[in-house]
């Protein structure tokens, strides 16, 4: 059920373009995210018995399409690898090692947080360009599958409690929860 079902309709692999380099590390100066209204970063491996778990994140570069229109620039998408397990057993070529016990729980690497990126779409035949915000995976996490193997049945590691709305870790330059920006002159 999730947005992933839409992915193939809206993306196009760019021939000859490899994976993007990993994004640069974020500034060490962290914000008080509760005060700033962001979602605190989610740490699915904080529980002591799963601290070794690792989740594979791959980057792909694609043009996005919306009907006949195509993005003016390629977009880097993060894709969560299907398997996850103890980091020390996770091979470079993922999938070669079946690390879990036959009767043990099954874990899957799935999207944890999402982010939006503005995309300018150019359309053929002189049609007006479009502006969209694309939903991209911001991070991945390991979840335990129940016997139903449903997305809605995936279980998180560790408890989650009420928290300030949203905030994955703010990207560099991100604003905190604050007054309406509309008071500023339109920058576009």
């Amino acid at each position: 059920q999730g947005w992933q079902a839409f992915r193939n309709d809206a993306t196009e692999v760019i021939p000859g373009l490899g994976e993007y380099p990993e994004p640069p590390p974020e500034n060490n100066q962290t914000m008080n995210r509760a005060e700033n209204g962001g979602r605190p970063p989610h740490h699915p491996y904080d529980a002591k018995d799963v601290s070794e778990y690792s989740c594979r994140e791959l980057h792909y570069t694609r043009f996005l399409t919306d009907g006949p229109c195509r993005s003016a620039k390629p977009v880097t998408e993060l894709v969560c690898s299907g398997q996850c397990g103890p980091a020390r057993l996770l091979p470079n070529a993922i999938g070669r090692v079946k690390w879990w016990r036959p009767n043990g729980p099954d874990f899957r690497c799935i999207p944890d947080r999402y982010r939006a990126q503005r995309v300018q779409l150019l359309c053929p035949g002189g049609a007006a360009p479009r502006s969209r915000k694309v939903r991209l995976v911001a991070s991945c996490k390991c979840k335990r599958l129940t016997r139903f193997h449903n997305q809605s049945e995936l279980k998180d590691f560790g408890p989650e409690t009420a928290r300030p709305q949203k905030g994955r870790k703010p990207r560099p330059g991100a604003r905190g929860a604050k007054a309406n920006q509309a008071e500023l002159e339109n920058a576009y």
Partner: antibody
Framework: EVQLVQSGAEVKKPGASVKVSCKVS????????IHWVRQAPGKGLEWMGG????????IYAQKFQGRVTMTEDTSTDTAYMELSSLRSEDTAVYYC??????????????WGQGTLVTVSS | QAVVTQEPSLTVSPGGTVTLTCGSS?????????PYWFQQKPGQAPRTLIS???DKHSWTPARFSGSLLGGKAALTLSGAQPEDEAEYYC?????????FGGGTKLTVL
């Protein structure tokens, strides 16, 4: 299909606080961008605040800054909007709204049924 | 704070065409304001008709269309039906903050 179910009507005294809940089903809360909108009787829609996925932050309308807090409980897929220091002009129907969880962000696609908050002494 | 302006009221004959507009006090409305249009009938929650200037939804009747006209966002209704009588609101995105217009009361008469 995303569905939003809000808590029931509330009657509050001036100066009190109110906390309205919005239960999400069909998707998990972390997949969605929740916004809160209110409508005073006979008036127009007014955006109060919500999650901006571009920056990963909650943004509040200037008018409500310092009085409103938007939180979530991901274990129950429930979003909350708390408004403090209530006054009579806060009497309104409060709506939560969310995107459709599609590949392209389309905000305000699904709406809760609304929660009437009456502020009266 | 930005002010988003709409016509307070408009009247259209059944089968006729009408255009509702949405302007911004900060200047011309562009595709980067991702204009939204909502329909609201008395006692009901709003319903999204148009997102991102011109993007219709599965439930949006074909007679509604969105565009940009003369520095404003526009909602055009072609072939008005009695059930289209409602309040219509536009919404503009100012970098993650949103501002609603005051609404247009559309009468089909």
């Amino acid at each position: 299909e995303v569905q939003l179910v809000q808590s029931g009507a509330e009657v509050k005294k001036p100066g009190a606080s109110v906390k309205v809940s919005c239960k999400v089903s069909g998707y998990t809360l972390s997949e969605l961008s929740i916004h809160w909108v209110r409508q005073a009787p006979g008036k127009g829609l007014e955006w109060m605040g919500g999650f901006d996925p571009e920056d990963g932050e909650t943004i509040y309308a200037q008018k409500f800054q310092g009085r409103v807090t938007m939180t979530e409980d991901t274990s129950t897929d429930t979003a909350y909007m708390e408004l403090s220091s209530l006054r009579s002009e806060d009497t309104a129907v409060y709506y939560c709204a969310t995107d459709s969880a599609g590949y392209w962000y389309k905000f305000f696609q699904h709406w809760g049924q609304g929660t009437l908050v009456t502020v009266s002494s | 704070q930005a002010v988003v302006t709409q016509e307070p009221s408009l009247t259209v004959s059944p089968g006729g065409t009408v255009t509702l507009t949405c302007g911004s006090s900060t200047g011309a409305v562009t595709i980067d304001h991702y204009p939204y249009w909502f329909q609201q009938k008395p006692g009901q929650a709003p319903r999204t008709l148009i997102s991102d200037t011109d993007d219709k939804h599965s439930w949006t009747p074909a007679r509604f269309s969105g565009s940009l006209l003369g520095g404003k966002a526009a909602l055009t209704l072609s072939g008005a039906q009695p059930e289209d009588e409602a309040e219509y609101y536009c919404l503009l995105d100012y970098g993650g903050s949103f501002v609603f217009g005051g609404g247009t009361k559309l009468t089909v008469l």
